[in-house]
């Protein structure tokens, strides 16, 4: 595989990662697929410093991140441990609210207008952030 040493065009470099900020909305799963096609993943927030960086770039807009509990426990899309990791939920969140009338609860996490996190219906068309790490060899499979 080839090692990525600088960020692609239209991506923002920060602390050895590259970030891409959407300007339109998609459902969480579609945003997840989008990032995967960019050889990236929905943003995984591992520190207060990274939280502030992302918050600065997205502004006061609901924005998906790479955190969900669609299969039970909360999980980060890159495997980062949720229980021991950084969290920035709004008070009384996540609440898996069923009162929205859209069916089911709330299984996907997003940045709210003040940057703190909320769980919401995964089908909502929010903006999103993709992240990929520099110096990580791309997982190019061998041709059979």
């Amino acid at each position: 595989g080839s090692e990525r040493t600088c960020c692609p065009v239209n991506w923002v470099e920060h602390e050895r990662s590259c970030y891409w900020f959407s300007r339109s909305g998609k459902a969480w799963a579609d945003a997840d697929n989008y990032c995967r096609l960019e050889d990236a993943h929905l943003v995984v927030v591992t520190s207060w410093e990274e939280q502030k960086f992302v918050q600065h770039h997205i502004g006061p807009v609901n924005t998906w991140m790479g955190l969900h509990d669609q299969n039970g426990p909360w999980k980060w899309v890159d495997g980062t441990d949720y229980e021991t990791g950084f969290k920035n939920w709004r008070p009384e969140q996540p609440d898996d609210w069923y009162g929205h009338g859209l069916g089911g609860g709330e299984d996907c996490a997003h940045f709210t207008d003040d940057g703190r996190w909320n769980d919401d219906v995964c089908q909502r068309p929010y903006r999103w952030v993709c992240e990929t790490e520099l110096d990580k060899a791309s997982q190019e499979p061998p041709l059979l």
Partner: antibody
């Protein structure tokens, strides 16, 4: 000049296999996701498959899942579509296309015709 | 899967005419819509991205508009080279899906 050139089409019997190739030039191939899109005679366009720039992520239309495999060799600037268990309904012109940040396709090859018939 | 429909399926027009083609998605797709032009025996050509963004080199007589489920491609003054088939594509969700096309031919 940005260019895509498909090859490998032809006549194949039902149940047979074929491998299509798409040679890319004029852009940094490994930086872009690439797709295959097909068009049956007299019909509209149908998206078939897409792969990320590294080849590490792939998606398929339900109509070809389990039968077709998309892959790429970035050292050769080439995209592939391995087609197995071919059916009459796979008869079409197959185009390779370069994906944009808007999830659409800005560069297309000239197409290669695949005919599945006994 | 998101279904895309177009109307009309064909339109006869003259040089200089204003032509309007509509595309409808079976569910909301925000502005994730592209328009293509295709001539017989040729590959499609991307005209418009993100519902209204004109591709570089595409004449300004082509205009895209709409959001959600209803979209429009307008050719403000039809030129001889514009006689072709036009189709839309939703870029919101996999699998990406195309409209059936609208053929613009000479009246």
């Amino acid at each position: 000049e940005v260019q895509l050139l498909e090859s490998g089409g032809g006549l194949v019997q039902p149940g047979g296999s074929l491998r299509l190739s798409c040679a890319a030039s004029g852009f940094i191939f490994s930086s872009y996701a690439m797709s295959w899109v097909r068009q049956a005679p007299g019909k509209g366009l149908e998206w078939v498959s897409v792969t990320s720039g590294s080849g590490g992520t792939t998606f398929y239309a339900d109509s070809v899942k389990g039968r077709f495999t998309i892959s790429r060799d970035n050292s050769k600037n080439t995209l592939y579509l391995q087609m197995n268990s071919l059916r009459a309904e796979d008869t079409a012109v197959y185009y390779c296309a370069k994906r944009t940040q808007f999830d659409d396709f800005d560069i297309w090859g000239q197409g290669t015709m695949v005919t599945v018939s006994s | 899967d998101i279904q895309m429909t177009q109307s009309p399926s064909s339109v006869s027009a003259s040089v200089g005419d204003r032509v309007t083609i509509t595309c409808r998605a079976s569910q909301g797709i925000s502005n994730w819509l592209a328009w293509y032009q295709q001539k017989p025996g040729k590959a499609p050509k991307l005209l418009i991205s993100a519902a209204s963004n004109l591709q570089s080199g595409v004449p300004s007589r082509f205009r895209g508009s709409g959001s959600g489920t209803d979209f429009t491609l307008t050719i403000t003054s039809l030129q001889p080279e514009d006689f072709a088939t036009y189709c839309c594509q939703q870029a919101n969700s996999l699998p990406f899906t195309f409209g059936p096309g609208t053929k613009v031919d000479i009246k």
